[in-house]
Amino acid sequence: KKVVLGKKGDTVELTCTASQKKSIQFHWKNSNQIKILGNQGSFLTKGPSKLNDRADSRRSLWDQGNFPLIIKNLKIEDSDTYICEVEDQKEEVQLLVFGLTANSDTHLLQGQSLTLTLESPPGSSPSVQCRSPRGKNIQGGKTLSVSQLELQDSGTWTCTVLQNQKKVEFKIDIVVLAFQKASSIVYKKEGEQVEFSFPLAFTVEKLTGSGELWWQAERASSSKSWITFDLKNKEVSVKRVTQDPKLQMGKKLPLHLTLPQALPQYAGSGNLTLALEAKTGKLHQEVNLVVMRATQLQKNLTCEVWGPTSPKLMLSLKLENKEAKVSKREKAVWVLNPEAGMWQCLLSDSGQVLLESNIKVLPTW
């Protein structure tokens, strides 16, 4: 008996061939001997089966001795043995229809789990193997689960269902809802304007939700809500903004915030959360601000940084075009009685300058 695998919702064509290459009488029946369709001369006739409105044939092939049964919009319950009667012969084809669906939604938040469920006909024992867009293979039976979805899991998942040494392939598009970056750091000199950007890693037609930026300043004992906003059809509208600092927010995606000036009291870490409509959970992006200040008070030249710096960062004070006078893995360095000239305060990571502030020291007479 020939086995054909079909996909739920698709169209399948079951073949039936006569030895005579001409149009002769044929019938397709199901395992209960109920007629599905056949012919009467050059006319297609249909029986009382439940496939009535979804069954068809190709009349153009009858003259060649081919009498296919076409079943549209396949359902799991269409799985059956179909019998083609032609020239006093019976050809049997076993059709097995499978369906593969993602749990609840194909748009999932980063960190959530994806469950793929296989619908299969009674009596079948299929195996399923899925390949994620990043090349990870998972195997299972009726259900497959992937916990802790990552951004790289966005894309087309290709799943192969194997039954009776035949296979059928499913493609499921999964969108992992997340920010492009989990964390970012902005380095600024005191007084400079600060821009924070929160690009999303996905695009959808309409995007609705609400968000908030909480800020933990290094100098503050507790965190503070800096801004709350709504997102409707991709348009951003500010609901509430703190008076200090007076943030500005762009009205279009990607989410974008501007701080008029970097000040030591703003240095710290923020957490932007975005709750999307009809989704449980929130998207998060961490943002960090490091602020540098170089000052000269009487005979003391000081350079300080505030904010979340890593212990391996180096803070240096040097006279332009000269070797560093002082270089430490600390958040403040100073030089007593600095000589006249343009001094540079540098914050660097393995030789790469992250932040630089210049201060002119005038000669003392």
Epitope: E195, K232, N233, E235, V238, G250, K251, K252, H256
Partner: antibody, heavy 118, light 107 residues
Framework: EVQLLESGGGLVQPGGSLRLSCAAS????????MSWVRQAPGKGLEWVST????????YYADSVKGRFTISRDNSKNTLYLQMNSLRAEDTAVYYC???????????WGKGTTVTVSS | AIQMTQSPSSLSASVGDRVTITCRAS??????LGWYQQKPGKAPKFLIY???TLQSGVPSRFSGSGYGTDFTLTISSLQPEDFATYYC?????????FGQGTKVEIK
């Protein structure tokens, strides 16, 4: 063809009221934000107000906040600007504009003139 | 509110000239900037959005550039129909603000 036609302008005394209308055609009105922009005689362009699409968020310039009200009737494809407590400095040509998908004002009407004078 | 400063306020040029108009924002506005052209007695015409994207139907002699606070509108070879007033508009957030305009006149 996308078209915007303003009406309702005229001469009004200071402290008076006026309601401007803008009839839209040639596009799916309910899916786009709409705005009013004005231009005083011999002066530059000044944004007045915006109403987002069917959600209906409204935004105003500080100079008109509390006096002007923007609204829309999606069933009639019409945008309105209710202007109360009018002042001499509100004298201008008022343009109705349509926002595109990127929220830029891409289509403008021909304008209607509002004169506030005693 | 974000202030938009346009310069020059007016300029005289001849047909075929290359013309540059600049617009400066009082704070960073990404590339959320549009350019409009207005002729006397007419409604403004939309030329450029997102700082550098030409609106369909606008001749390719018009181009825009910039990001953050500094933006430029360039007309590579001025044509007779280009004599008009040009406005920049910040579309970063509300209130939307226009530059004061640059009048391009015939020399």
């Amino acid at each position: 063809e996308v078209q915007l036609l303003e009406s309702g302008g005229g001469l009004v005394q200071p402290g008076g009221s006026l309601r401007l209308s803008c009839a839209a055609s040639g596009f799916t009105f309910s899916t786009y934000a709409m705005s009013w922009v004005r231009q005083a005689p011999g002066k530059g362009l000044e944004w007045v107000s915006t109403i987002s699409d069917n959600i209906g968020n409204t935004y105003y310039a500080d100079s008109v906040k509390g006096r002007f009200t923007i609204s829309r009737d999606n069933s009639k494809n019409t945008l309105y600007l209710q202007m109360n407590s009018l002042r001499a400095e509100d004298t201008a040509v008022y343009y109705c504009t349509k926002d595109n998908e990127d929220y830029y004002m891409d289509v403008w009407g021909k304008g209607t003139t509002v004169t506030v004078s005693s | 509110a974000i202030q938009m400063t346009q310069s020059p306020s007016s300029l005289s040029a001849s047909v075929g000239d290359r013309v540059t108009i600049t617009c400066r924002a009082s704070q960073g506005i990404r590339n959320d900037l549009g350019w409009y052209q207005q002729k006397p007695g007419k409604a403004p015409k939309f030329l450029i959005y997102a700082a550098s994207t030409l609106q369909s139907g606008v001749p390719s002699r018009f181009s825009g550039s910039g990001y953050g606070t500094d933006f430029t509108l360039t007309i590579s070879s001025l044509q007779p129909e280009d004599f008009a007033t040009y406005y920049c508009l910040q579309d970063y957030n509300y209130p939307r603000t226009f530059g004061q305009g640059t009048k391009v006149e015939i020399k």
